[in-house]
């Protein structure tokens, strides 16, 4: 007698490993013999699909080599024309040993920045990821964390974080190891021992000593009064990432000697500077006492910046002070043609007031230096990016002459207004007419109710107030 189909063995959930065989059984009783069709996620499996084998009149479905994409719901449907069609469904859960799909790579990073070593994994059950540094499991702490993705994040990278790392992915089916990668930590150049100032007699020998460190080990160059050292012998030694440089000098004139430590990080340089003065004990004989004199400014370049009829200090160490100082300003002024409209007026004010310092007349005419705070404001608030570019050009030797170095004051060497407000000069040109500034940069998201130059922000790729560019 005709009999409607009945599924006597309902489909069950099948667990299978990748590349293994998985079989679903759908036992049917009926008369006449039913037609049995199979679906995966409601899509018909074609009889001629070579990835499958359908046997026993369609009652057995075998997946010949399971892939992770075979996960899903499989259903068999039996129909013989008597009564309705019947269906049974079961799930295939693809189990997978851990596999590292995005392994970590070698990383070079600057101390203090954030490092991320990737380690993306696959597997079922989802693998847990841990890391090994050297031969030991890596412990997480406030700086070091394994992210949900498996990647290793290290905040504020320290020298001791350097080393060999590998990630380990583990589940109940097995363990996978990444290849070993290297984390190299680079450190900005830093001066450990600055040269000391000396007051010596004419014709003596003096050795200036400068020690610096960094990764890679920095090189040390010496500058004398803004120019490369022309005389004297330099001896250097390197030990344990510390470079030691000794400059031996025969003293015939006073001078400012600067030790510059530089190292390279990719395409960028970091520098650290320290200076020492050599003065000669008997240098201040009465006839040499006057190092300059006061006179009204008669030049052109600084006309708009200096007060009308300003009394300025002219330095007699130049043969023709007026001409030499004007040339100095003129050379530096040309560099300012390309700077931003925010920086330019402030830089011009700084330049002119530094090269043509206000003069205090008296028995000994005295130059009045710019107040340190005004120098810092120009450098860090108005001209942060430009100052950085200038320093980078200095490192790369892109300036035709070293004259511009004399025109840029070292802010830290200037007197503070806190010491004696009358002993230093203020810059009168640090406030702007809004109309002159069409491209005023925005402040942070919280806008104050004043128009102000932008402070350097962390998003600025070219600027970082850090030991990289030791803006003293």
């Amino acid at each position: 007698l005709p009999k409607a189909p009945v599924i006597t063995t309902p489909l069950e959930t099948v667990d299978a490993l990748v590349e293994e065989v998985a079989t679903f059984m759908c036992a049917v009783e009926s008369y006449p013999q039913p037609e049995i069709s199979w679906t995966r996620n409601k899509i018909l499996i074609k009889l001629f699909d070579t990835r499958y084998s359908i046997r026993e009149n369609g009652q057995l479905l075998t997946i010949l080599s399971v892939e992770d994409s075979d996960d899903g719901i499989y259903c068999c449907t039996a129909n013989n024309g008597v009564g309705g069609a019947v269906e049974s469904c079961g799930a295939l859960q693809v189990k997978m040993k851990p596999k590292i799909t995005r392994p970590p790579i070698n990383v070079k990073i600057i101390e203090g920045l954030k490092a991320v070593l990737p380690c993306t994994t696959m597997g079922n059950p989802k693998p847990s990821v841990s890391w090994i540094k050297g031969d030991s499991p890596l412990r997480e702490n406030s700086r070091i964390a394994v992210l949900e993705s498996g990647s290793l994040r290290i905040h504020n990278v320290q020298k001791e974080d350097a080393g060999q790392y590998r990630c380990v992915a583990k589940n109940s089916l097995g363990t996978a190891y990444s290849k070993v990668v290297k984390l190299e930590v680079e450190v900005f150049a830093r001066i450990l021992r600055a040269p000391e100032s000396h007051n010596v007699t004419f014709g003596s020998f003096v050795t200036l000593h400068c020690t610096a460190t960094g990764i890679p080990v920095p090189t040390i160059t010496w500058i004398e009064n803004g120019n490369a050292v022309s005389s004297g012998s330099i001896q250097e030694s390197v030990k344990d990432r510390v470079i030691d440089s000794r400059l031996q000098l025969f003293i015939t004139k006073p001078g400012l000697y600067t030790c510059i430590a530089t190292n390279k990080h990719g395409e960028k340089f970091s520098t650290a500077k320290a200076a020492a003065t050599i003065s000669i004990a008997e240098w201040s004989k009465p006839q040499k006492d006057n190092k300059g004199y006061c006179a009204q400014y008669r030049g052109e370049v600084c006309n708009a910046v200096l007060a009308k009829d300003a009394l300025v200090f002219l330095n007699t160490s130049y043969a023709d002070p007026e001409e030499a100082q004007e040339l100095l300003v003129h050379t530096a002024w040309n560099e300012l043609k390309v700077v931003s409209p925010v920086c330019r007026p402030a830089a011009e004010a700084l330049l002119c007031n530094h090269i043509f310092q206000e003069c205090s007349p008296g028995v000994v005419p005295t130059p009045i230096p710019i107040c340190r705070e005004y120098c810092l404001a120009v450098k860090e608030l108005f001209c942060a990016k430009e100052w950085l570019v200038m320093e980078e050009k200095t490192h790369r030797g892109l300036y035709r002459s070293e004259m511009h170095l004399l025109s840029v004051p070292e802010c830290s060497k200037l007197p503070s207004m806190h010491w004696d407000p009358t002993a230093c000069a203020r810059l009168p040109h640090l406030d702007y007419n809004k109309e002159n500034l069409k491209t005023f940069p925005p402040m942070t998201s919280s806008k104050p109710s004043v128009d102000i130059p932008n402070l350097p922000s962390s998003s600025s790729s070219s600027f970082s107030v850090s030991p990289t560019y030791s803006m003293t």
Epitope: E373, Y374, A377, A384, M417, V450
Partner: antibody
Framework: EVQLVESGGGLVQPGGSLRLSCAAS????????IHWVRQAPGKGLEWVAS????????SYADSVKGRFTISADTSKNTAYLQMNSLRAEDTAVYYC?????????????????WGQGTLVTVSS | DIQMTQSPSSLSASVGDRVTITCRAS??????VAWYQQKPGKAPKLLIY???SLYSGVPSRFSGSRSGTDFTLTISSLQPEDFATYYC?????????FGQGTKVEIK
Amino acid sequence: EVQLVESGGGLVQPGGSLRLSCAASGFTVSSSSIHWVRQAPGKGLEWVASISSSYGSTSYADSVKGRFTISADTSKNTAYLQMNSLRAEDTAVYYCARSEGDRYVSGYMGFDYWGQGTLVTVSS
Amino acid sequence: DIQMTQSPSSLSASVGDRVTITCRASQSVSSAVAWYQQKPGKAPKLLIYSASSLYSGVPSRFSGSRSGTDFTLTISSLQPEDFATYYCQQSGVWLITFGQGTKVEIK
């Protein structure tokens, strides 16, 4: 001798107003920057507002913007903080402080002189 | 806005100890950073300005330094009168933020 003396604090209901004064002596308000800083009971310091009267420029913390107004009367050598729409979280000791120089250099100078503080309590 | 994260929030030390307090700026800032000392019921006092300059009248055992976005106040040899709360302060062009404070207590 440089001195700053605050006054005008007291108890006020939420939504109410108060005007704090900061009388300066020993220096001129016009050549310095004046700042208001507050300290809630048992808490740290919080900057509120600043003024540089030589440029007539002012600036405010986000928490008080639109409610507080800082001003200065150079003839009286006094700075003021007008506080409107007061909230319970504005309860604090309010200090006025000065820094030398205009708005660009005052940050480098630090706040070198402070008043003794005046207590503002906002409560119903 | 720039945040100044000050650490530690408190510390216990003995007279003669060397004490270091750090403030980390959330982004690159200028050297317009000051340090203050405050005692209970009193107004703060300026110790250091421009990151590393000692304010007049402040004992030389106090010093300030900077490394990138990290600013440090060091007391080389703690004295009985130094037990107080210390704050760092960063000034943008008048977007001013203080650190949360560090209370230095007697061990």
